[in-house]
Amino acid sequence: DAHKSEVAHRFKDLGEENFKALVLIAFAQYLQQCPFEDHVKLVNEVTEFAKTCVADESAENCDKSLHTLFGDKLCTVATLRETYGEMADCCAKQEPERNECFLQHKDDNPNLPRLVRPEVDVMCTAFHDNEETFLKKYLYEIARRHPYFYAPELLFFAKRYKAAFTECCQAADKAACLLPKLDELRDEGKASSAKQRLKCASLQKFGERAFKAWAVARLSQRFPKAEFAEVSKLVTDLTKVHTECCHGDLLECADDRADLAKYICENQDSISSKLKECCEKPLLEKSHCIAEVENDEMPADLPSLAADFVESKDVCKNYAEAKDVFLGMFLYEYARRHPDYSVVLLLRLAKTYETTLEKCCAAADPHECYAKVFDEFKPLVEEPQNLIKQNCELFEQLGEYKFQNALLVRYTKKVPQVSTPTLVEVSRNLGKVGSKCCKHPEAKRMPCAEDYLSVVLNQLCVLHEKTPVSDRVTKCCTESLVNRRPCFSALEVDETYVPKEFNAETFTFHADICTLSEKERQIKKQTALVELVKHKPKATKEQLKAVMDDFAAFVEKCCKADDKETCFAEEGKKLVAASQAALGL
């Protein structure tokens, strides 16, 4: 479906409001340091140009690609060189190299101030004064901090954000109404960003085949009644959508996502019985709902997998004729029977099956060679099962905060070179697996836990890639996408690590800790814990627990004192001395 003017085509398909929002997201994800006003100006210029193309598709420059139009616009920013340094060199390149260059300069951890939430009355006034600017600012602030956020989904978040303010700013108790909603949006937003980051990493670092394999497994679990052909079609379309969004082609991505939702709803009879409610919703809610829909029930009477993939005399013939299609069928058949497995486990099984066929189909007696292939799956299945069982027991025993601390110690000992803020952030998120997944029955624990851990470990991988400091992290992150978690689990204490010099300043605390929220206070304590382990990697659990208990008592005592600052200064010195003695520093 070639269009004379791509920009006119997308403007007409998406409508002005979505067009402007998506262009703003795209620009903010590329130029993460630019002020809001500059982006709004660029977006307005692009929108006015798009309107001229809608009026006359043959008008000057209307035939240019979106990358060319958007790239040219970004390259008009006057302060590009001083704000972004070498990113300005992208502007000397031609498309498609220029866009690739912009993509490579996306920063997963931009040096931006933390978003501080103003008072509710201040927010409500701003919302009422200029609703459009208020919502644009939300898109801008999220997009620049999360340069891979799934753009059509961000439109859905913005819609909910608007609804929250519309409802709560006229409520009797504005804060009681609004704050829980904003907390929920923030937490869901962070989770959504991290999930999408893994999809983009999968596509960009491991290629389309890796993403398609993931999609076959996940969609087969979700739509077990759908035929292989149907799943294959959905996988192809979904891959296109995510390739576009991860590549910065946000208008095409949003348009194609809408088409995919339309197709799924028009064909729900042959896809899933669980889609009815989703398909009655408006577009943004519909797409979100489909993406989160529960797994359909498995069809009755599915035969044993062995008949097709072990016992059949045609296994090697089928494999040789179309390797990826046959492996896709294996993954489809296995995944639809196993909603209780994580996607990454299913992909490990498929990889094992592929490796076995590669070896056995060249052997003298192929059938004899691959006859026991399913036996090789047993340890692969048991490993995550046992790990989840052990960690859920630990979580139930300790509670979330102390479970996070156990993981902080574990991961700091594995990869002590990683920066303290990254170790704290990643370990805190790893620790959330407990409250997120351990409440589930056995059949839902593994897909919840291991696929969540894949998302969190990807955060570690992308943050580490920016400033690599550990060969072990690089190795686990780059060797195999599906084996990242087992790779990190298998790491022992890094014996090559030279302990960090002791610095009393790291363990000096002030009265400001008393006014922090519980979460911020936890982060302070967890930061100190990581630093302790970096100073004394061989410290035992008991030693670390004793020091942390003393530390908690010290903070509690000084926060109750009349002269807090003096207490922190004097008692802090004693605590540092006692800790040094306890740990033999």
């Epitope: 292989f228 052909a229 009879d269 997998l305 993939f309 059949s312 045609d314 069928m329 489809y332 058949e333």
Partner: nanobody, 118 residues
Framework: EVQLQESGGGLVEPGGSLRLSCVAS????????MSWVRQAPGKGLEWVSS????????SYADSVKGRFTMSRDNAKNTLYLQLNSLKSEDTAMYYC???????????LGQGTLVTVSS
């Protein structure tokens, strides 16, 4: 457009055998599980059997288990149903349909009639 052409039916005595065929066109045959269903005179549609995409895995209704065998030849886009030890209650119009154990209405071809009578 999806087309399924059944053949091989006929009149047979109880205890006899038949082999039904179904040639598929208009879709990627090897990417679909396939099924046979039947409709006895004056009755509703009854599922008979299904075969997996690859062709090794099969499933049968209790009423035909051990007597009927389903297979497929993906290279020829053809589905088969071998009917042995036929009984009078097997008398029906037999249709092949796309999909595993179909529990949603699907378009039917013209079918092939199997009559078991002495």
């Amino acid at each position: 457009e999806v087309q399924l052409q059944e053949s091989g039916g006929g009149l047979v005595e109880p205890g006899g055998s038949l082999r039904l065929s179904c040639v598929a066109s208009g879709f990627t045959f090897q990417h679909y599980a396939m099924s046979w269903v039947r409709q006895a005179p004056g009755k509703g549609l009854e599922w008979v059997s299904s075969i997996s995409v690859v062709g090794g895995g099969t499933s049968y209704a209790d009423s035909v288990k051990g007597r009927f065998t389903m297979s497929r030849d993906n290279a020829k886009n053809t589905l088969y149903l071998q009917l042995n030890s036929l009984k009078s209650e097997d008398t029906a119009m037999y249709y092949c349909v796309r999909g595993w154990h179909p529990d949603v209405p699907r378009p039917l071809g013209q079918g092939t009639l199997v009559t078991v009578s002495s």
